[in-house]
């Protein structure tokens, strides 16, 4: 049965579709396969820190080192990708900080997507000095294994020189790589010695070899592409939000809820209210009122703004987010002070998030 009673004819699932808006994400740490990664838990005054990955407790092992507020992953692999959290337990409360780890190279071969520095890779030779092809920037070719999330753009580079200027061609799994071999084809930027594939899918997995040759010789370099699959997940809410707040009577206040969701999220702001002088219905469930929800008539649903507040506005405000997979919620308290009392930012103690993975 539902864990609450709704008042004032509000419904949990409005009939109109939700509005699309920018979904915020936890901080993302990127590492290439084989690299080591060190993350510091960004929480203060932590007596005890515990770590989780994708909701499962994380303990030390031969590749994972937990020292104080630091998490170290040695020799990262794509399996280390996921949603991590550190929870700081204190004497009076606990707080959680979430971050993403991507063991990948989203734009591969250590280069920016727009090739701003690519021109220097196109080396012109004195016409008298005949020379077989050679690599001009091996640093950009060091990472051979590229694990990339589906739908990302991948770029492989083989910066080379030679005289006469070498030509470049690409092979996939040892065979000529043709445009029709993938949906959407691919781009080759000869001046930047690069192969670009947009919106990669799992069928793009494989070995990609650049062959650079002129009449004096031929060199080649092979990259391995792994496209990391994703599974549907329920919404993730940024820890610490919404934050407790206080204001004076007549003041304004904002609560913010940051949401991460691949699937379209539906956001609701809910408050505990009284009906006929009671906070609970005959069934013992609390009365709740939906103050705002994402929909066609709603502005940025991640923010709940309260203006000219009264003492009646004091209480707990719940940010509840659902998608077709599941839901999550976090809450904060509003304290309304008499006008003569100056407001101060309260210690931001957040209710435990409803992460139940």
């Amino acid at each position: 049965r539902p864990s609450f009673s709704l008042v004032e004819d509000t419904t949990l699932e409005p009939e109109e579709p939700p509005t699309k808006y920018q979904i915020s994400q936890p901080e993302v740490y990127v590492a290439a396969p084989g690299e080591s990664l060190e993350v510091r838990c960004l929480l203060k005054d932590a007596a005890v820190i515990s770590w989780t990955k994708d909701g499962v407790h994380l303990g030390p092992n031969n590749r994972t080192v937990l020292i104080g507020e630091y998490l170290q992953i040695k020799g990262a692999t794509p399996r280390d990708s996921g949603l991590y959290a550190c929870t700081a337990s204190r004497t009076v409360d606990s707080e959680t900080w979430y971050f993403m780890v991507n063991v990948t190279d989203a734009i591969s071969s250590g280069d920016d997507e727009d090739d701003t520095d690519g021109a220097e890779d196109f080396v012109s030779e004195n016409s008298n000095n005949k020379r077989a092809p050679y690599w001009t920037n091996t640093e950009k070719m060091e990472k051979r294994l590229h694990a990339v999330p589906a739908a990302n753009t991948v770029k492989f580079r083989c910066p080379a020189g030679g005289n006469p200027m070498p030509t470049m061609r690409w092979l996939k799994n040892g065979k000529e790589f043709k445009q029709e071999h993938r949906i959407g084809g691919y781009k080759v930027r000869n001046q930047h010695w690069s192969l670009i594939m947009e919106s990669v899918v799992p069928s793009d997995k494989g070995n990609y070899t650049c062959v650079v040759e002129n009449e004096y010789g031929s060199i080649n370099h092979t990259y391995h592409l792994d496209v990391v699959e994703r599974s549907p997940h329920r919404p993730i809410l940024q820890a610490g939000l919404p934050a407790n707040a206080s204001t004076v009577v007549g003041g304004d206040v904002e609560f913010v809820c940051k949401v991460y969701s691949d699937a379209q999220p539906h956001i609701q702001w809910i408050k505990h209210v009284e009906k006929n002088g009671s906070k609970y219905g005959p069934d013992g469930l609390p009365y709740l009122k939906v103050l705002k929800h994402s929909g066609i008539n709603s502005s940025n649903a991640e923010v709940l703004a309260l203006f000219n507040v009264t003492e009646a506005d004091a209480g707990e405000y719940i940010c509840k987010v659902s998608n077709y997979i599941g839901q999550a919620n976090q809450s904060a308290w509003l304290t309304v002070l008499p006008k003569q009392q100056a407001p101060g930012r309260e210690k931001e103690i957040t209710a435990s998030p409803d992460y139940l993975e």
């Epitope: 049965r1 539902p2 864990s3 609450f4 949990l12 699932e13 109109e16 579709p17 939700p18 699309k20 589906a150 739908a151 919106s199 899918v201 994703r230 599974s231 549907p232 997940h233 329920r234 691949d262 699937a263 379209q264 539906h266 659902s322 998608n323 077709y324 997979i325 599941g326 839901q327 409803d354 139940l356 993975e357």
Partner: antibody, heavy 114, light 107 residues
Framework: QPYLQQSGAELVRPGASVKMSCKAS????????MHWVKQTPRQGLEWIGA????????SYNQKFKGKATLTVDKSSSTAYMQLSSLTSEDSAVYFC???????WGQGTTLTVSS | DIVMTQSHKFMSTSVGDRVSITCKAS??????VAWYQQKPGQSPKLLIF???YRYTGVPDRFAGSGSGTDFTFTISSVQAEDLAVYYC?????????FGGGTKLDIK
């Protein structure tokens, strides 16, 4: 490995009610919505509604409000769907499916006949 | 409600062929579309979610694309075991509606 086991086929009289079950195993039952889907040759696949087991929140397709009632028993990781005032139009295969529609039950065949 | 329209109820193809099934939403659903395969007497099986993400364990030959109102599901090289009905579904807003299905026949 997640698994959804649905109750067996039902043959019921018009006007009666039926309650079918979907027992979940292999994952945290309370962490995912449980969806119910109706399938008939004429209408194809129709989403009936969903329930979030952790707090009992439900969401219904307007078409099935008053017809279907979704409940859960967290202690046994089982979701239930009750269909009331049955008519021949309710004869169908009913599926339960986990939140992301990534795991489905095998289906319960309901036949309404006098 | 958002209506999902699969224009072809039947499609005939040969083993090794490339086949594409289309689905049109009655309003913008961003990339909130899934594709399912259903074989006779079986439950639907998730192949693609969020328009282009292939679900775990699904063979590479299955792919999805599209955004907004127009979506495509592609089998790059049809196998005999791909004989089935394929459904699209929007998971943008409730009620989560399905397309009418496209039955793929192998010549």
């Amino acid at each position: 490995q997640p698994y959804l086991q649905q109750s067996g086929a039902e043959l019921v009289r018009p006007g009666a009610s039926v309650k079918m079950s979907c027992k979940a195993s292999g994952y945290t039952f309370t962490s995912y919505n449980m969806h119910w889907v109706k399938q008939t040759p004429r209408q194809g696949l129709e989403w009936i509604g969903a329930i979030f087991p952790e707090n009992g929140d439900t969401s219904y397709n307007q078409k099935f409000k008053g017809k279907a009632t979704l409940t859960v028993d967290k202690s046994s990781s089982t979701a239930y769907m009750q269909l009331s005032s049955l008519t021949s139009e309710d004869s169908a295969v009913y599926f339960c499916a986990r939140g992301g529609f990534d795991y489905w039950g095998q289906g319960t065949t309901l036949t309404v006949s006098s | 409600d958002i209506v999902m329209t699969q224009s072809h109820k039947f499609m005939s193809t040969s083993v090794g062929d490339r086949v594409s099934i289309t689905c049109k939403a009655s309003q913008d659903v961003s990339t909130n579309v899934a594709w399912y395969q259903q074989k006779p007497g079986q439950s639907p099986k998730l192949l693609i979610f969020s328009a282009s993400y292939r679900y775990t364990g699904v063979p590479d030959r299955f792919a999805g694309s599209g955004s907004g109102t127009d979506f495509t599901f592609t089998i790059s090289s049809v196998q005999a075991e791909d004989l089935a009905v394929y459904y699209c579904q929007q998971h943008y807003s409730s009620p989560y509606t399905f397309g009418g299905g496209t039955k793929l026949d192998i010549k």
